[in-house]
Amino acid sequence: KEWQCPRTPYAASRDFNVKYMVPSFSAGGLVQTMVTYQGDKNESAVFVAIRNRLHVLGPDLKSVQSLATGPAGDPGCQTCAACGPGPHGPSGDTDTKVLVLEPALPALVSCGSSLQGRCFLHDLDPQGTAVHLAAPACLFSAHHNRPDDCPDCVASPLGTRVTVVEQGQASYFYVASSLDAAVAASFSPRSVSIRRLKADASGFAPGFVALSVLPKHLVSYSIEYVHSFHTGAFVYFLTVQPASVTDAPGALHTRLARLSATEPELGDYRELVLDCRFAPKRRRRGAPEGGQPYPVLRVAHSAPVGAQLATELSIAEGQEVLFGVFVAGKDSGPGVGPNSVVCAFPIDLLDTLIDEGVERCCESPVHPGLRRGLDFFQSPSFCPNPPGLEAPSPNTSCRHFPLLVSSSFSRVDLFNGLLGTVEVTALYVTRLDNVTVAHMGTADGRILQVELARSLNYLLYVSNFSLGDSGQPVQRDVSRLGDHLFFASGDQVFQVPIQGPGCRHFLTCGRCLRAQRFMGCGWCGNMCGRQKECPGSWQQDHCPPKL
């Protein structure tokens, strides 16, 4: 038998301690929210909010402008001044809870924890490739806001998620806020609402539709809104909330809420429980049937998938999939599985399950004892009755009321437990060529860029590197601008190339040339690198013979 070179073990073919320097910006305080803007004339910006300040950065993370958003009551607060002479309410720091783009006349909308959670609209001013903000407009009309009914009170100090949808020419703000008794009593934000921005930007139209946790449940039943997004005909919110109203706070689980993006009403509000599990290939004795549950969503992102993953998920290439990072939760006992798992929920399948759930509730024969659910939002009732009614009403349709779908959607960890002890705190998924890549931030300040594939028993890394020495957790919000992602950790914002920061972590030529084509890696004498880093010969096709 011919002699062969010994194989290099897979783990020895890469070094994740290689240092990569990526562009960064020091914000001067803990980054609270971040959003990017890409205009149609090559102008772009990164907006970064910290306590009492909003930074406008160029795509290169150089500072362009900075705006004081607090403290409320301070003469230096530039946004507060837009509301005219005060006082406007209690003074205090402004934590930015919402930072979204209003598409119509492109503008940035920011909403903070101060001044009853009101918002400000900043027109965008492109100057060359940079973007500036105009003086803010105060989205608050004193005469139509009262403590018990406040259309212009948007942000909750406990957290708010907003997705903006254009319907016709109007901009509708789909808002989801975490509440407790104290917050609910102060200028009455709602749990879920759809608010129309008035054409004259004088605030939001009164008489908006909303759902709120009922007063009797406010103390025990809290909902955390983790993520929101718009795709197709719907807006989706992802929540972590108690599994049971009666046992609240109790065990937590994750739900997807679906709202119509074409009709600003909540009659077709639907919720579905998302179930993510770790199912090891070989089940240990005593391990739960169907896998170990990971009920608590940490972060989520939806994206169209590449051909390879689409095939594994039995869906078409380019279809939208919701990816979630789940953890076991505090009361799950000593688990033997990984710290984080990643589950994939195809949107079309989610919609089908929801629609089937509506049929089960509303089409005869209705299974006796099937509950409409959402008892924290509405009076208890059985299908097909409207909330609070003992029998169906002839004038009302069963479908025109909120519903919790009776079945859950169960998936298993895409990574088969291979994330191990890694605690994922941020997630952004991209499609590159026919490959789907998960860009993940971790609790110890690292970035993992990993190919998403179900069938492998190892992780296909694009990169795994540390953002710096602080080791602070990477925050939940991730934004994209062109070929870069922007991650925040502590008081810093980092710009990470989608195709990875480099190739130097691949130590062998074989491993280097097996890297995904989109990474642009090639063998360069005695190291793996990109062509522009390589003054000499650069080879992407074959390795020099080993001597």
Epitope: H144, Q169, A170, A199, D200, S202, A205
Partner: antibody, heavy 120, light 107 residues
Framework: EVQLQQSGPELVKPGASMKISCKAS????????MNWVKQSHGKKLEWIGL????????IYNQKFKGKATLTVDKSSSTAYMELLSLTSEDSAVYYC?????????????WGQGASVTVSS | DILLTQSPAILSVSPGERVSFSCRAS??????IHWYQQRTNGSPRLLIK???ESISGIPSRFSGSGSGTDFTLSINSVESEDIADYYC?????????FGAGTKLEVK
């Protein structure tokens, strides 16, 4: 003193296109959106659309989409409205009016109007 | 689209009288209504903004009121220079819309 100076009256043939200008002075041109309003001979006022000179963003009345195109030239503080494929229905006086799109403001200054007559 | 209905179409009053113009919106628009005066061969001129807010340079005899769907413009002592058409305009929703106008005549 705030002024909006519009171009003069025009007589144009059916099927042709034409451009009306509105030159702003006496204020920061990019600070206000520019609105365009049509007044037919029946005295009816119709809002055509607006442009934000700040960033070129536009919002149109659906009724005038495809009929009117709004642009600005920041360097000369001038707003333009091009009217396409003119018919007799487009004969009217067209006004430009500035508006600060935020609570507390309305269309506070108007141009003198540009009369357009479409006739063969 | 929000329809604004102005009534009456023509108002005829004597100098010194008080006069009121009505504007009704097809749906609630808060106070996002503005009033304009247009004299013969002139451009519209802003009189009142946001239902009741006065405009500098506009005589104090002009005032506005209302919210929701019903709005009123009043001239508390009409003068001959007030002969004009009066229009209401809403800025609550796109597209912005105007009422058909009320013509003021002085006897």
């Amino acid at each position: 003193e705030v002024q909006l100076q519009q171009s003069g009256p025009e007589l144009v043939k059916p099927g042709a296109s034409m451009k009306i200008s509105c030159k702003a002075s006496g204020y920061s041109f990019t600070g206000y959106t520019m609105n365009w309003v049509k007044q037919s001979h029946g005295k009816k006022l119709e809002w055509i659309g607006l442009i934000n000179p700040y960033n070129g963003g536009t919002i149109y009345n659906q009724k005038f989409k495809g009929k009117a195109t709004l642009t600005v030239d920041k360097s000369s503080s001038t707003a333009y409205m091009e009217l396409l494929s003119l018919t007799s229905e487009d004969s009217a006086v067209y006004y430009c009016a500035r508006w600060l799109r935020r609570g507390g403001y309305a269309m506070d200054y108007w141009g003198q109007g540009a009369s357009v007559t479409v006739s063969s | 689209d929000i329809l604004l209905t102005q009534s009456p179409a023509i108002l005829s009053v004597s100098p010194g009288e008080r006069v009121s113009f009505s504007c009704r919106a097809s749906q609630s628009i808060g106070t996002s209504i503005h009033w304009y005066q247009q004299r013969t061969n002139g451009s519209p001129r802003l009189l009142i903004k946001f239902a009741s807010e006065s405009i500098s340079g506009i005589p104090s005899r002009f005032s506005g009121s209302g919210s929701g769907t019903d709005f009123t413009l009043s001239i508390n002592s009409v003068e001959s220079e007030d002969i004009a058409d009066y229009y209401c305009q809403q800025s609550d929703s796109w597209p912005l819309t105007f009422g058909a106008g009320t013509k003021l005549e002085v006897k």
